[in-house]
């Protein structure tokens, strides 16, 4: 874990990367994609308290405000920081091709 | 407005840029800010439902698999997609000096 | 994400020197404005110094000519040299990042 990674919520319920599976019925790609079959989506899942991966001077604005005004303003939001490319097998009309998806899996997450 | 701005919600209830205005007390600032006094605060705020202003594939996925397991898998987060420079006037030992933060105020909106 | 570790307090006597030492990590301290609170016994937390991004430095007429803030940005790192130390600058001494993320603190006493 990095410098600043301790979850004050508790093991595991803040800001992380989590990896749910998902088939190709279950994200709509049935009908264009024929492999992978089934995918691992990696997402960033988790609460954001004070200052936690705080991705920058907005995120932690945000936190302020957020004490101040908790019903007009939210709490940071977990969002992916970075992200890893994909390779599909797509279909075609002449056959199949390989498209590669730089912004589809989560590499890493932060707040804001 | 772009392509999937239509807030199925009602008009305003969506992911839109809001203003906050805030205090330099309020941002915890008031020790080394002498201008402005006050800041109007751009922020994202508002709901992300199915394809509204969807950052990338990764958003869309999201929606997807959120429908499907609402409980595992939160829907998409309204979050800056840009950012707007902001000059902030401090005492210095020599006088006063302008300095801009360049990711401090949210200047457009999207759902990731 | 956002963390600051001080360092380098300790027990001093009357007329003596310490440097300070604030590491941070989750984010690059170049863009922001740097600064040293401390807080006596009994008392408020209170700004002592700080640096903003463009270089120009603040301290309190109590320690000016006594204490200087710097900056190494390649480390990532903030200092504050103290010297000609008096029993009244007895305190835990704090690093802040102006945006609400503050350090543990670092004791500083000066007693002969």
């Known amino acids: 874990a990095r410098n600043g990674d301790h979850c004050p919520l508790g093991p595991g319920r803040c800001c992380r990367l989590h990896t749910v599976r998902a088939s190709l019925e279950d994200l709509g790609w049935a009908d264009w994609v024929l492999s992978p079959r089934e995918v691992q989506v990696t997402m960033c899942i988790g609460a954001c308290p004070s200052q936690f991966r705080a991705a920058n001077m907005h995120a932690q604005i945000k936190t302020s405000l957020h004490r101040l005004k908790p019903d007009t303003v939210p709490a940071p939001c977990c969002v992916p920081a970075s992200y890893n490319p994909m390779v599909l097998i797509q279909k075609t009309d002449t056959g199949v091709s390989l498209q590669t998806y730089d912004d589809l899996l989560a590499k890493d997450c932060h707040c804001i | 407005a772009r392509n999937g701005d239509h807030c199925p919600l009602g008009p305003g209830r969506c992911c839109r840029l809001h203003t906050v205005r805030a205090s330099l007390e309020d941002l915890g600032w008031a020790d080394w800010v002498l201008s402005p006094r006050e800041v109007q605060v751009t922020m994202c705020i508002g709901a992300c439902p199915s394809q509204f202003r969807a950052a990338n594939m990764h958003a869309q996925i999201k929606t997807s698999l959120h429908r499907l397991k609402p409980d595992t898998v939160p829907a998409p987060c309204c979050v800056p997609a840009s950012y707007n420079p902001m000059v902030l006037i401090q005492k210095t030992d020599t006088g006063v000096s302008l300095q801009t933060y360049d990711d401090l105020l949210a200047k457009d909106c999207h759902c990731i | 994400q956002v963390q600051l570790v001080e360092s380098g307090g300790g027990l001093v006597q009357p007329g003596g020197s310490l440097r300070l030492s604030c590491a941070a990590s989750g984010f690059t301290i170049r863009t922001y404005t740097m600064s040293w609170y401390r807080q006596a016994p009994g008392k408020e937390r209170a700004l002592v110094a700080y640096?903003?991004?463009?270089?120009?430095?603040y301290h309190i007429d109590s320690v000016k000519g006594r204490f200087t803030i710097s900056r190494n940005n390649a480390e990532n790192t903030v200092y504050l040299q103290m010297n000609s130390l008096k029993p009244e600058d007895t305190a835990v001494y704090y690093c802040?990042?102006?945006?609400?993320?503050w350090g543990q603190g670092t004791q500083v006493t000066v007693s002969s």
């Open positions: 640096i903003t991004p463009g270089g120009p430095t």
């Open positions: 802040g990042n102006g945006f609400g993320s």
